[in-house]
């Protein structure tokens, strides 16, 4: 009985042609949606003139279907028991699951104006950039449509730079027709306890973004884990969205469409300051904004974004220190709505349901030489949007799963 099931599981979770795992791995059978909530700034002039608190009002959800494309360039390497691939990116707007259209407008931070003095911390160049910002009539805030903000728009200020630079700006630009990877993962053929664990990403075993062990690529991509998951296990996974490896711990047992699953959650200490969690010391890469590494709940991923001042957090600054959220009004963090979780079927290690929640923020600092920013009296980590990416096993697949896996065990 049990030995036969274990043998079957070990055979079927291997990532090679013909297995159950491989078929679902190449192209997920789960419909994955990414919902966006945009933080619409209510008092842009007051902030730019008086350095007031930024009043935001979230608007959403605006929903896109994502992860519907099959993995490409799948290549097995029998020598080291790995399989490599790229994951194509694509997003299709779902009007019926959205509160408005892609043409809805929002007042948000001017991404280029905020980023330019951060990238060019040179007073001479800032004077030059100020001339361009003024000429283009750009200011600290801008009004952009959802489509522009997410997927890119031609920035009028950057368009004046008389050199061949990229003038398109967008939170996720470029996205459509791009790929994530190359990933190289263990196929589990020689050792099932390594199945789906990432061996390398973009040809490297480290990210080159963080010092020390923070730079390691740990675990899987969170779509599955090695089988026979125990509650005591810490699930480690790498997320290219946040440019780091992270982990989840057991939270509770859940019944998902008749399938018993373990809900693993991202613990608060994953976002803690080095003061609270010494393991996080290497995620604190600058001392000023982080108040000498005492702030928590935000991750500076600038090194991973060509030096742009991008900070990742949980939505509404959940689990973030008061100094981070204090300059922003209108945030209401809520554990249930804003945490990330993975519902993992413990026998196979397959993630059957998940909710990945994160917030994209941009740092804007006072800049004496740039008129649009010269009245600021303090730096702000400005929330731009938050997203909720969810997937749940379909009813048909759930029935099949019960028949083939959990039913047999019962």
């Amino acid at each position: 009985g049990d030995m036969l099931i274990e043998k079957t599981i070990k055979r079927e979770v291997v990532l090679e042609e013909g297995t159950t795992a491989f078929k679902n791995w190449v192209k997920t059978g789960t419909t994955v949606y990414r919902q966006f909530w945009i933080f619409d700034v209510q008092n842009p002039d007051d902030v730019a003139k008086n350095s007031s608190k930024i009043k935001v009002k979230q608007r959403g959800p605006y929903t896109y279907r994502v992860r519907y494309l099959a993995k490409e360039n799948i290549t097995q390497d029998p020598e080291d028991h790995t399989v490599s691939f790229v994951q194509p990116n694509g997003a299709i707007f779902e009007p019926s699951l959205s509160v408005g259209t892609e043409d809805d407008n929002f007042t948000v931070l001017n991404l280029a104006v905020a980023a330019a003095p951060h990238i060019y911390q040179n007073s001479f160049v800032q004077v030059v950039l100020n001339s361009l910002i003024k000429k283009s009539k750009s200011s600290m805030f801008q009004t952009r449509s959802l489509k522009e903000l997410l997927w890119g728009y031609k920035d009028p200020f950057l368009s004046l730079v008389p050199y061949p630079i990229s003038t398109t700006v967008g939170v996720f630009y470029p996205y459509n027709d791009t790929v994530d990877g190359v990933y190289k993962v263990f196929n589990g053929k020689d050792n099932i306890s390594k199945v789906a664990i990432i061996e390398s990403y973009k040809g490297k075993r480290n990210l080159s973004y963080w010092p020390s062990y923070c730079d390691m690529i740990n675990g899987t991509d969170a779509a599955s884990f090695p089988p026979f998951v125990e509650k005591s296990r810490t699930l480690r996974f790498f997320s290219s969205d946040i440019c780091r490896s992270i982990y989840a711990v057991f939270g509770s047992e859940i019944d998902l469409k008749g399938i018993p699953v373990y809900r693993f959650v991202l613990p608060a200490n994953a976002f803690a300051s080095p003061l609270q969690n010494p393991d996080n010391h290497c995620f604190c890469t600058e001392k000023v904004i982080s108040n000498n590494c005492t702030s928590y709940g935000v991750l500076d991923i600038g090194k991973c974004k060509e030096g742009k001042p991008v900070y990742i957090s949980l939505p509404h600054f959940l689990h973030a220190s008061p100094d981070v959220s204090e300059p922003i009004e209108g945030l209401h963090p809520n554990e249930d709505e804003h945490r990330t979780y993975l519902d993992v079927e413990p026998i196979t290690g397959f993630t059957l349901q998940f909710a990945k929640r994160l917030q994209v923020n941009i740092l804007v600092k006072p800049a004496r030489k740039i008129e649009a920013l010269k009245n600021l009296k303090r730096p702000y980590i400005v929330p731009i949007l938050w997203l909720n990416e969810t997937g749940t096993i379909g009813d048909e697949k759930a029935e099949m799963f019960k028949t083939q896996v959990t039913g047999k065990i019962k």
């Epitope: 040179n122 001479f124 160049v125 004077v127 030059v128 100020n130 001339s131 000429k135 008389p162």
Partner: antibody
Framework: EVQLVESGGGLVQPGGSLRLSCAAS????????IHWVRQAPGKGLEWVAW????????YYADSVKGRFTISADTSKNTAYLQMNSLRAEDTAVYYC??????????WGQGTLVTVSS | DIQMTQSPSSLSASVGDRVTITCRAS??????VAWYQQKPGKAPKLLIS???SLYSGVPSRFSGSGSGTDFTLTISSLQPEDFATYYC?????????FGQGTKVEIK
């Protein structure tokens, strides 16, 4: 092809005035801004004045502040340096130069200004 | 104002020699340093920007290094056409300032 051509140099008495011109071709001065840099005989290079892009602000070395004025006529793609109250120590070859990020990638051939009685 | 101090003020070298010119800024200018070559009666020519970035068309025997306050221009194998005066310049803060120059002469 990018080119800068200075003109207007010559001999002038102390206290006198002179206007130098810098005609640009192959790029628009509006987009880059223009600098003037001078070199006294047998000496090193000294930055003098700058007009930032798009009719932006103007900046001057302390040694010429209040006496020299930089300007540009974008329709002619030409920059000017109006030099008043000239002194013997202003004697130099004056170069106009193109810069965006603060280094000078193109220079004119220079025009000699001699201040002497 | 940021002072740029170049050394030596002059040097004698032979064709094929490796030549090093240094430049020290009076305060941190990160990597915002350019190097120029000037021949008598001619305008300066840009060699290097951002301390290390070779300008297009400049021979690869020229290289720049350094960041913060200390910078170096190296000519790996001196050629006859390299005998000239070399200037460093900081492009970090206005006013833009130059070093006093280093004259490279034939030994």
């Amino acid at each position: 092809e990018v080119q800068l051509v200075e003109s207007g140099g010559g001999l002038v008495q102390p206290g006198g005035s002179l206007r130098l011109s810098c005609a640009a071709s192959g790029f628009t001065i509006d987009a880059f801004g223009i600098h003037w840099v001078r070199q006294a005989p047998g000496k090193g290079l000294e930055w003098v004045a700058w007009i930032a892009p798009y009719g932006g602000d103007t900046y001057y070395a302390d040694s010429v502040k209040g006496r020299f004025t930089i300007s540009a006529d974008t329709s002619k793609n030409t920059a000017y340096l109006q030099m008043n109250s000239l002194r013997a120590e202003d004697t130099a070859v004056y170069y106009c130069a193109r810069s965006f990020f603060g280094y000078f990638d193109y220079w004119g051939q220079g025009t000699l200004v001699t201040v002497s009685s | 104002d940021i002072q740029m101090t170049q050394s030596p003020s002059s040097l004698s070298a032979s064709v094929g020699d490796r030549v090093t010119i240094t430049c020290r800024a009076s305060q941190d200018v990160s990597n915002w340093v350019a190097w120029y070559q000037q021949k008598p009666g001619k305008a300066p020519k840009l060699l290097i920007s951002y301390a290390t970035s070779l300008y297009s068309g400049v021979p690869s025997r020229f290289s720049g290094s350094g960041s913060g306050t200390d910078f170096t221009l190296t000519i790996s194998s001196l050629q006859p056409e390299d005998f000239a005066t070399y200037y460093c310049q900081q492009h970090s803060n206005a006013p833009l300032t130059f070093g006093q120059g280093t004259k490279v002469e034939i030994k």
